[in-house]
């Protein structure tokens, strides 16, 4: 037999099909010009010493073969003895190690068999009613195709599916969408309506994420508040990476999961913008405010479930940084200014109440006064901090109040509202004899003592009603008792107590009269 012809004899090897899983596969045969044809196939397994034979049977009952040697591609003309206008069946037999391995048969009319291409360009992937929709442009001059897909997950083998007939400039396919695992898809095409035409090669992998992006499993920690009133949010644990099928490992466009950080500043609700979304890789600095932090995972199908954490407010207080002066027109606060043109947010809430009851006020951008102080004033009519109770005050500052991550904490402190000097007056002052020349004075704690750092000291005043002499005794804010000594028996005294703050003198309690009885010896 001539090498250019199909040899109509028994093949030069015994028929001993091994039935093994390896061997020739994916045989494709088509016309490549007006009178020339090509068949190509793939061979799986060790290639050393393998000889390939392209077998062909005609409808007349005759069969022939081409010897391809070690090649996996063979061309022949319409004069090679193979009927090109009638149906033939072709397959490859590979002879190696005293056994043959067969490819599946393809049955076709060679003349009408055109080499079809797989989808070549961009394959658009979208979600449609819980399914995956793939769409691509039909390769040039190849309108009219049958399309198949195959898909696999990281843990499952290829599964074959059918896209049905296509007859347009764009082709599409509906495929199953997995809820929680990534998939790799490949597509192939063949001529529509041409019995037994060969399938194209498989397309490049299309990598598809799961419908639900993986829930982020991350942990955060927050550093201590620095001198600049900011603290860094750090990521303790990176989100787990999505497991990918074999063909999607490495560069797998389409399966990317993006993690975004959504910050919600709970403090200072009167500011313009309360939330900000950032890339997870860019960890922000935060003020000492309370925040909710959500990590949102999303893929090309949209966002998934998010994970939310609460970052409590930094409650470290600065007892001396804030000066408050109360005048007839109202109240003014002074604190060390941060910089030029700063916007301040002053937030206050009654101590012991839910954080949701915080009130705040935003100042216009202000420069420091000549003493380097920033100020905030309010009138009595405004009702701000007007009740006689303890308030927790936090002042935040920002040169760019519209940018959530640029706020810093200036100070946090406590303030007793309303008429603190009167409200703080100690009650239930009592005097008990202590010795022949001393008494013990006790009183109930001032309301100011409920406000950390506000009560500077108690002052106890003792007045000798005879000589009109007055003595004053400072007492630590944590004490509610003092011993007055050097008193004379039979003399009338009055005692009063007041509670002072750093910037206010308290109001004296009601005078309490007492005397030490003269001891009569028997």
């Amino acid at each position: 037999c001539r090498t250019s012809e199909c040899c109509f004899q028994d093949p030069p090897y015994p028929d001993a099909d091994s039935g093994s899983a390896s061997g020739p596969r994916d045989l494709r045969c088509y016309r490549i010009s007006s009178d020339r044809y090509e068949c190509s196939w793939q061979y799986e397994g060790p290639t050393a010493g393998v000889s390939h034979f392209l077998r062909c049977c005609l409808s007349s009952g005759r069969c022939c073969y081409f010897a391809a040697g070690s090649a996996t591609r063979l061309q022949f003309s319409d004069q090679a003895g193979v009927s090109v206008l009638y149906t033939v069946t072709l397959w490859v037999e590979s002879w190696a190690r005293n056994q043959t391995e067969k490819s599946p048969e393809v049955t076709l009319q060679l003349y009408n068999s055109v080499k079809y291409e797989p989808p070549l360009g961009d394959i658009k992937v979208s979600k449609l009613a819980g399914q995956l929709r793939m769409e691509w442009e039909t390769p040039d001059n190849q309108v009219g195709a049958e399309v198949q897909f195959r898909h696999r997950t990281p843990s499952s083998p290829w599964k074959l599916g059918d896209c049905g007939p296509q007859d347009d400039d764009t082709e599409s396919c509906l495929c199953p969408l997995e809820m929680n695992v990534a998939q790799e898809f490949q597509l192939r095409r063949r001529q529509l309506g041409s019995q037994g035409s060969s399938w194209s090669k498989w397309s490049s992998p299309v990598c598809v994420p799961p419908e639900n992006p993986p829930q982020p499993q991350v942990r955060f920690s927050v550093e201590q508040l620095g001198q600049d009133g900011r603290r860094r949010l750090t990521l303790k644990e990176q989100p787990t990476q999505l497991e990918l099928p074999e063909g999607c490992q490495g560069l797998a466009p389409g399966t990317e999961v993006t993690y975004r950080l959504q910050l919600h500043m709970l403090s200072c609700p009167c500011k313009a913008k309360a939330t900000r979304t950032l890339h997870l890789g860019k960890m922000p600095y935060l003020s000492g405010a309370a925040y909710n932090v959500a990590v949102i995972s999303s893929n090309q199908f949209g966002p998934g479930l998010n994970q939310t954490w609460h970052i409590p407010a930094d409650t470290h207080t600065e007892p001396v940084a804030l000066n408050i002066s109360v005048g007839t027109n109202g109240t003014t606060m002074y604190w060390p200014a941060r910089a030029q043109s700063m916007t301040y947010c002053i937030e206050w809430q009654p101590v012991g109440q839910d954080g949701g009851l915080a009130t705040c006020s935003l100042t216009a951008p202000q420069d420091p006064d000549p003493a380097g102080m920033a100020t905030y004033s309010w009138s009595r009519e405004s009702g701000a901090m007007g009740q006689e109770k303890c308030y927790y005050i936090t002042i935040f500052a920002s040169a760019h109040p519209e940018k959530l991550t640029l706020w810093s904490t200036v100070l946090s402190t406590y303030h007793f509202g309303g008429n603190a000097s009167a409200a703080g007056t100690p009650h239930h002052v009592s005097v008990k004899n202590h010795s022949l020349d001393s008494v013990s004075v006790d009183w109930a704690p001032s309301l100011l003592s409920t406000c950390p750092g506000v009560l500077k000291e108690y002052v106890v005043r003792c007045r000798d009603e005879d000589s009109k002499q007055v003595s004053e005794h400072p007492v630590q804010p944590t004490e509610t008792q003092v011993t007055l000594s050097g008193l004379r028996a039979g003399v009338a005294y009055t005692v009063q107590v007041r509670a002072d703050t750093a910037w206010l003198r308290g109001v004296w309690s009601q005078p309490q009269r007492f005397s030490i009885e003269v001891q009569v010896s028997d």
Partner: nanobody, 126 residues
Framework: EVQLVESGGGLVQAGGSLRLSCAAS????????MAWFRQAPGKEREFVAG????????HYVDSVKGRFTISRDNGKNTVYLQMNSLKSEDTAVYYC???????????????????WGQGTQVTVSS
């Protein structure tokens, strides 16, 4: 030992249908082209239908074209003959045969076949 065992024959009225099966054992079934032959009393054994090893090509004698269908299932090592619109002249013993697919995949004469079954009787009554 190679065995081809036919089944599915029987008595049927004209115009009726039967499906014959031939189960192969002792050979690598997918290496073989398969065929059905029949032999009526006092006549030569004649070719009815043939099929390539992968099922891609089929061939029928003119008298059964459009009425009979040959098919195979290589997973089950079985070849079938679906017979519809049966006529009294279809009465015969039906044999299945196998041949290696060398330079031919069917022969119209029995001498081209390597293995044979024992046959199954089909009787069509008018």
């Amino acid at each position: 030992e190679v065995q081809l065992v036919e089944s599915g024959g029987g008595l049927v009225q004209a115009g009726g249908s039967l499906r014959l099966s031939c189960a192969a054992s002792g050979l690598t079934f997918r290496n073989y082209a398969m065929a059905w032959f029949r032999q009526a009393p006092g006549k030569e054994r004649e070719f009815v239908a043939g099929i390539t090893w992968g099922g891609g090509l089929t061939h029928y004698v003119d008298s059964v074209k459009g009425r009979f269908t040959i098919s195979r299932d290589n997973g089950k090592n079985t070849v079938y003959l679906q017979m519809n619109s049966l006529k009294s002249e279809d009465t015969a013993v039906y044999y299945c045969a196998g041949k290696t697919q060398g330079s031919t995949w069917y022969h119209l004469t029995p001498d081209g076949y390597d293995y044979w079954g024992q046959g199954t009787q089909v009787t069509v009554s008018s």
